[in-house]
């Protein structure tokens, strides 16, 4: 079966939207009205990976772009990046582990844990217009909870 994907936008728990910040970075900021059109639309693909009770493995691509969020070590630290891929080969059922996130969805709140680096989560800062990053703490200053809005 082909990989099933859905199109969505994500907002963090403070209702900050995610937008492009240069060619290979996302940032989180509050948007209103027409500015909401700036937010990135993700293509969330359901992929094969390790499953546990509340975790569903997904890959997060940017709709109509050959870019995927991926997790790599940079200077010995797990780091979130946007990685360019060959659109002829992606998405695929068995994505490389760096592209896989465990989607944890409880009461309409979502977390995205890196499959490559367990206990590291897609995170945003409390401050405005800061980069989206991979954070190693939940429930601290940084925000790891998101809501998802379906896009047709």
């Amino acid at each position: 079966a082909p990989v099933r994907s859905l199109h969505c936008t994500l907002r963090d728990a403070q209702l900050k939207s995610l937008v492009m910040s240069g060619p290979y970075e996302l940032k989180a900021l509050h948007l209103q009205g027409q500015d909401l059109e700036q937010q990135v639309v993700f293509s969330m693909s359901f992929v094969q990976g390790e499953e546990s009770n509340d975790k569903i493995p997904v890959a997060l691509g940017l709709k109509a772009k050959n870019l995927y969020l991926s997790c790599v070590l940079k200077d010995d630290k797990p780091t979130l990046q946007l990685e360019s891929v060959d659109p002829k080969n992606y998405p695929k059922k068995k994505m490389e582990k760096r592209f896989v996130f465990n989607k944890i969805e409880i009461n309409n709140k979502l977390e995205f844990e890196s499959a490559q680096f367990p206990n590291w989560y897609i995170s945003t800062s409390q401050a405005e217009s800061m980069p989206v990053f991979l954070g190693g703490t939940r429930g601290g200053q940084d925000i790891t909870d998101f809501t998802m809005q379906f896009v047709s």
Epitope: F46, K93, K103
Partner: antibody, heavy 120, light 111 residues
Framework: QVTLRESGPALVKPTQTLTLTCTFS??????????VSWIRQPPGKALEWLAL???????YYTTSLKTRLTISKDTSKNQVVLTMTNMDPVDTATYYC????????????WGQGTVVTVSS | QSVLTQPPSVSEAPRQRVTISCSGS????????VNWYQQLPGKAPKLLIY???LLSSGVSDRFSGSKSGTSASLAISGLQSEDEADYYC???????????FGGGTKLTVLG
Amino acid sequence: QVTLRESGPALVKPTQTLTLTCTFSGFSLSTSGMWVSWIRQPPGKALEWLALIDWGDDKYYTTSLKTRLTISKDTSKNQVVLTMTNMDPVDTATYYCARMREGSRAFDIWGQGTVVTVSS
Amino acid sequence: QSVLTQPPSVSEAPRQRVTISCSGSSSNIGDNAVNWYQQLPGKAPKLLIYNDDLLSSGVSDRFSGSKSGTSASLAISGLQSEDEADYYCAAWDDSLNGPVFGGGTKLTVLG
């Protein structure tokens, strides 16, 4: 803890319609990537998949029984209902509901099953 | 007639290793994940292996799965009497647009 429980009549007469309910807890069918399925097993025989419903209300049916089956969900009640029309003695089986997840499409948690006998 | 083909029965002595085969086609095993289930007598099936070779939570590592082309196999090492059960393979089938099961294999642990 994820659990699923099937309920419905133990005995139905030929030509009648069977209605089975799967009540689940520990997960939500509004969670993207979640599915619930019905599978049956006639006495001493193999497992046979019947129907599937996913978080977005997409429905899938086994080809041979498509005209007789209807699957639906009530997300607020955490229930999935299967109806099967025009029951026949060959439909006598244990009917299971099970959770499935999108990536692996594996039935990872099963109910205990409910035995349905079709006889006049 | 099941879409996936399994041997009806296999038997082996305790502490030995046994493999159960599952044969399909390009529309199911060839292009989709294979999952394996154990059904103990009188019980509901239980997921053992998913995504061809991943062990389900709480399952003994005596069980392992593999896949090559349009065939898959389940291996059980260090056989124990409690492994006596029916074993089913399953995979999504793109032609039928739904999951398909094998006919099941009855494992007997001798002695």
